[in-house]
């Protein structure tokens, strides 16, 4: 399992550490979550052939996973710090229901799935502090999330496996795009 952020998981600027800065905490947190996703993806890919499947598009149509687009201002072309930060936080909040869905989807990596979920909650808190002046952040509706969760859990086995694979892949891509953009803030 990856080392929790704040422990010796990464090169540090000095042997006697000052408390982590806000940007360093965020950076470490994202990398920690990405390590967790890699471990979960390994189990998913070993367990089924979803990672090589060409039928992803069929399942993807039923999911509304957050995705970075040009208009979000998180790419090098048209980078906009405020717009991008709102998108990152909003996207992470939208991912929470999907991370909840993942909780009963793993056998040997059950703890890892929980760690990814909890670490994402912490990351959202870090980012909300950074964006304290931004009021454009919308929180997903709990009722909508509850019915989505029920719908996902009612899928057949094949679709559940595919959904798990797609959530992990999309979350990894979203976090990598976020990490790239946050380096410019």
């Amino acid at each position: 399992a990856p080392v929790p952020p704040g422990e010796d998981s990464k090169d540090v600027a000095a042997p006697h550490r000052q408390p982590l800065t806000s940007s360093e905490r965020i950076d470490k947190q994202i990398r920690y979550i990405l390590d967790g996703i890699s471990a979960l993806r390994k189990e998913t890919c070993n367990k089924s052939n979803m990672c090589e499947s060409s039928k992803e598009a069929l399942a993807e149509n039923n999911l509304n996973l957050p995705k970075m687009a040009e208009k979000d201002g998180c790419f090098q072309s048209g980078f906009n710090e405020e717009t991008c930060l709102v998108k990152i936080i909003t996207g992470l909040l939208e991912f929470e229901v999907y991370l909840e869905y993942l909780q009963n989807r793993f056998e040997s990596s059950e703890e890892q799935a929980r760690a990814v979920q909890m670490s994402t909650k912490v990351l959202i808190q870090f980012l909300q502090k950074k964006a304290k002046n931004l009021d454009a952040i919308t929180t997903p509706d709990p009722t909508t999330n509850a019915s989505l969760l029920t719908k996902l859990q009612a899928q057949n086995q094949w679709l559940q496996d595919m959904t798990t694979h797609l959530i992990l892949r999309s979350f990894k891509e979203f976090l990598q795009s976020s990490l790239r953009a946050l380096r410019q803030m």
Partner: antibody, heavy 117, light 107 residues
């Protein structure tokens, strides 16, 4: 005009140490991540290390981790690379570069480091 | 680490030719690729970022395309100043890695 200028390259014996410097001008240095990249003769560039704008986030390539140390002084608009336990395969042109979204949009002209007995 | 493999290692062409250089990533990196041009005795110069975005000041005859693991740099009509070595670089994640280069020579 945006400019990066490296200095400190030299001929050094195996096991020796060297400190490279990079002076920046023409842009707001404290706003950018900065990196060191080297290129051995006839080879492609090799990324070595990146430091965040405030100096709190540092990454190293496995090939230099534990031997090289990156640092910066925003007041002086300078970037540094402290190199220890140098080996012959560390011989290369060392470039300082400005990183933007994991690519490098501004490069210095480079400084030559030769490790030989 | 993500390995970037360029092909061909060298190519000969004439002024006015259309030239395409290829780069393959060892894993899916979406469109996070940069392309550089390097002339002898000079530092690399950024041409393309994010797979297809032209860096400011770079002539429009240079273009980039591709996503996932396969990428291309195209020079639509070679000019004398374009003879140089070209490198791809994955800008997806650290450790940042470069291709081994493609040398563009005069035929």
């Amino acid at each position: 005009q945006v400019n990066l200028r490296e200095s400190g390259g030299d001929l050094v014996k195996p096991g020796g140490s060297l400190r490279l410097s990079c002076a920046a001008s023409g842009f707001t240095f404290r706003k950018y991540y900065m990196a060191w990249i080297r290129q051995a003769p006839g080879k492609g560039p090799e990324w070595l290390s990146t430091i965040s704008n405030s100096g709190d986030i540092i990454d190293y390539a496995d090939s230099v981790r534990g031997r090289f140390s990156i640092s910066r002084d925003n007041a002086q608009k300078s970037l540094y690379l402290q190199m220890t336990s140098l080996r012959p395969d560390d011989s290369a042109i060392y470039y300082c570069a400005r990183e933007y979204f994991f690519s490098f949009d501004v490069w210095g002209r480079g400084t030559m480091v030769t490790v030989s007995s | 680490d993500i390995v970037m493999t360029q092909s061909p290692s060298s190519v000969s062409a004439s002024v006015g030719d259309r030239v395409t250089i290829f780069c393959r990533a060892s894993q899916d990196i979406r469109n996070w690729v940069a392309w550089y041009q390097q002339k002898p005795g000079e530092a690399p110069k950024l041409l393309i970022y994010d797979g297809s975005s032209l860096q400011s000041g770079v002539p429009s005859r240079f273009s980039g395309s591709g996503s996932g693991t396969e990428f291309t740099l195209t020079i639509s009509s070679l000019q004398p100043e374009d003879f140089a070595t070209y490198y791809c670089q994955q800008s997806d994640s650290t450790p940042i890695t470069f291709g081994q280069g493609t040398r563009l020579e005069i035929k």
